[in-house]
């Protein structure tokens, strides 16, 4: 089996409010089994930004169809920029458990910080 | 309420072709994949076809490649199962399921019997 | 192929385990349906692995474990009677596959 790599190509991504920002991230397997969620920031007061399986994220649209089997894109964009969205931002894969889900491996982060206002 | 209405089954001879039909309501029909089941008389389960949220991807098992295509009208709220070349080992009770997030089922229609015989 | 008993029989109130085996647990995720008489629809009972949705009982519990996963109803009913169809997703081939179904008997 080839490892899984979770690839987030941009270390540093500048956005302005308003506007929508576009996280990338790819993997490079399938397997094993288990979805992929959204962070900002790390450890446990880490804010869930989205979730594969569930929940309500009005802000947030992913750029692929995740509804594919073989889809290995879980980029996303997020709505309305404001200040309180800076941060480093990581796409985490979980393998599946019981009775919870286990992390498997993380991205490096995409710092999110706000560029100069357009003149 | 989620609902799943099949339509379109009914008796066609050994090498015709018929289009079954399901009617989705209760849910956000383009956020879902799709899948046809079907069940032969006295048998189990087999999984013939699924269809990605968008329509632009399908799968399918071995044994209907080439005769049978799934295919979907999000505007409709309907997905479509096109059979062709049918013959008597195609006899079944056709569902149409609702995937979740990770392709198995959480809903299922209530089926529509198709019976292929001379 | 995955795997499970032809048949099961139990006393109301007894707990009844029912288990399915050859998936693998680095690739596959089980859901267990519910079916009560052939050609009825189905239901879902248990989905990823041990998911039980809103409107199914507590008593239905579901587990996986290395190449197995497992249904588990505790305190058993009569109306639980029916045939319990084991699922599975492989997330290697991208394909669905049922075992042939266990027919549970409440006495």
């Known amino acids: 089996e080839e490892e899984l790599q979770m690839i987030q190509p941009e270390k540093l991504l500048l956005v302005t409010v308003g506007k929508t920002a576009t996280l990338h991230c790819t993997v490079t397997s399938l397997l094993p089994v288990g979805p992929v969620l959204w962070f900002r920031g790390v450890g446990p007061g880490r804010e869930l930004i989205y979730n594969q399986k569930e929940g309500h994220f009005p802000r947030v649209t992913t750029v692929s169809d995740l509804t594919k089997r073989n889809n290995m894109d879980f980029s996303i964009r997020i709505s309305s920029i404001t200040p309180a969205d800076v941060g480093t931002y990581y796409c985490v894969k979980f393998r599946k458990g019981s009775p919870e889900n286990v992390e498997f491996k993380s991205g490096p982060g995409t710092e999110m910080a706000l560029g100069a206002k357009p003149s | 309420d989620v609902q799943l209405v099949e339509s379109g089954g009914g008796v066609v001879r050994p090498g015709e072709s018929l289009r079954l039909s399901c009617a989705a309501s209760g849910f956000t029909f383009s956020s879902y994949a799709m899948s046809w089941v079907r069940q032969a008389p006295g048998k189990g389960l087999e999984w013939l076809a699924g269809i990605s949220a968008g329509g632009s991807d399908t799968y399918y098992i071995d044994s209907v490649k080439g005769r049978f295509t799934i295919s979907r009208d999000n505007p409709k709220n309907s997905l479509y199962l096109q059979m062709s070349s049918l013959t008597a080992e195609d006899t079944a009770v056709y569902y149409c399921a609702r995937e979740t997030w990770n392709h198995l089922f959480d809903y299922w229609g209530l089926g529509t019997l198709v019976t292929v015989s001379s | 192929a995955l795997t499970q008993p032809a048949s099961v029989s139990a006393n109301p109130g007894e707990t009844v385990k029912i288990t399915c085996s050859g998936g693998?647990?680095?690739?596959?995720?089980y859901a267990w349906y519910q079916q009560k008489s052939p050609g009825s629809a189905p239901v879902t009972v248990i989905?990823?692995?041990?998911k039980r949705p809103s409107d199914i009982p507590s008593r239905f519990s579901g587990s996986a474990s290395g190449s197995a996963a497992t249904l588990i109803i505790t305190g058993v009913r009569v109306e639980d009677e029916a045939v319990y169809y084991c699922g599975g997703y492989d997330g290697r081939t991208y394909i669905n596959t049922f075992g042939a179904g266990t027919t549970l008997t409440v006495l």
């Open positions: 693998d647990y680095y690739s596959t995720y």
């Open positions: 989905h990823s692995d041990d």
